[in-house]
């Protein structure tokens, strides 16, 4: 079941999925000046069986100026630097995503893809939040959100994360509420879809959150 909405927006924070549940779809979008190749896929789809999941279809972009060609232009160094990638840096990868059954790992970038990736999540998907550069978590419970089905409608749980500018918190050096334990979560926010592996991702990620940042933009 597709989630009807996007994950909640937290001021000065971004979110990221560590792995994508089967059924997730990703728009095949190209950066300005490029378009999908003729008869190219509109979406990638995370699909698989009990032992292996992978992305069906492949996104391919070609220059808008050229007709009937699949020539793919390699970005110049400054273009590559500017690109906001959805790949997280290796120190940030909490666990091997392939170890999550029924999930796909982050699709590798395709040439000349758009700077922003638009995912269409399914029920049971978990995303993780962190403060953007220049902001820190003042106090925080679980910094994740799960898409849940309730009374036939989908909704995202509310992440317990507040991001504040570093100047505002300088009077409280090093002060930060400890991460709430799963037992401390309100019943309404507890999801039967959270697996041990999912929680392991969340806790390991929390440990590395303050020192690194991912730059994906989401709508």
């Amino acid at each position: 079941e597709l989630c009807d909405d996007d994950p909640p927006e937290i001021p000065h924070a971004t979110f990221k999925a560590m792995a994508y549940k089967e059924g997730t779809m990703l728009n095949c979008e190209c950066k300005r000046g490029f378009r999908r190749i003729k008869s190219g896929s509109l979406y990638m789809l995370c699909t698989g069986n009990s032992s292996h999941s992978s992305w069906d279809n492949q996104c391919q972009c070609t220059s808008s100026a050229t007709r009937n060609t699949t020539k793919q232009v390699t970005p110049q160094p400054e273009e590559q630097k500017e690109r906001k990638t959805t790949e997280m840096q290796s120190p940030m990868q909490p666990v091997d995503q392939a170890s999550l059954p029924g999930h796909c790992r982050e699709p590798p970038p395709w040439e000349n893809e758009a700077t922003e990736r638009i995912y269409h999540f399914v029920v049971g998907q978990m995303v993780y939040y962190q403060c953007v550069q220049g902001y820190r978590a003042l106090h925080r419970g679980p910094a994740e959100s799960v898409c849940k089905m309730t009374h036939g409608k989908t909704r995202w749980t509310q992440p317990q994360l507040i991001c504040t500018g570093e100047m505002e918190t300088s009077q409280f050096p090093g002060e930060e509420k400890p991460q709430a334990s799963p037992e401390g979560r309100p019943e309404s926010e507890t999801s039967c879809l959270v697996t041990t592996t999912d929680f392991q991702i969340q806790t390991e990620m929390a440990a590395t959150m303050e020192t690194s940042i991912f730059t994906t933009e989401y709508q």
């Epitope: 597709l2 009807d4 909405d5 996007d6 779809m25 728009n27 095949c28 979008e29 378009r35 509109l42 979406y43 789809l45 638009i118 269409h120 709508q219």
Partner: nanobody
Framework: EVQLVESGGGLVQPGGSLRLSCAAS????????MAWYRQAPGKQRELVAT???????TYADSVKGRFTISRDNAKNTVYLQMNSLRPEDTAVYYC?????WGQGTQVTVSS
């Protein structure tokens, strides 16, 4: 899920025009790449036109210059304006978003 409902099909003479509409619900419309497909009797479903989130259109060669795809994000609707219709345009026209399809609307071009 995404629900898609097409309308606007009908019988038209060669050279005539029709405007198809597809109303979408159930998912943030502005995040969707929208497409129109068509299927003629005994033939495979073929892509007619797509429109990006920013409104950029793409057309099949067979309809380029005659058909125009557009979207209204405020109304959660995508349109297909079909001009200079030909008998070979006769088909059931389907709206598509993600893996979801409308029920189709019949377009018949005949004198």
């Amino acid at each position: 899920e995404v629900q898609l409902v097409e309308s606007g099909g009908g019988l038209v003479q060669p050279g005539g025009s029709l405007r198809l509409s597809c109303a979408a619900s159930g998912r943030s419309f502005s995040t969707l790449i929208m497409a129109w497909y068509r299927q003629a009797p005994g033939k495979q479903r073929e892509l007619v036109a797509t429109i990006e989130r920013d409104g950029t259109p793409t057309y099949a060669d067979s309809v380029k210059g005659r058909f125009t795809i557009s979207r209204d994000n405020a109304k959660n609707t995508v349109y297909l304006q079909m001009n200079s219709l030909r008998p070979e345009d006769t088909a059931v026209y389907y709206c598509n978003a993600l893996r979801f399809w409308g029920q189709g609307t019949q377009v018949t071009v005949s004198s």
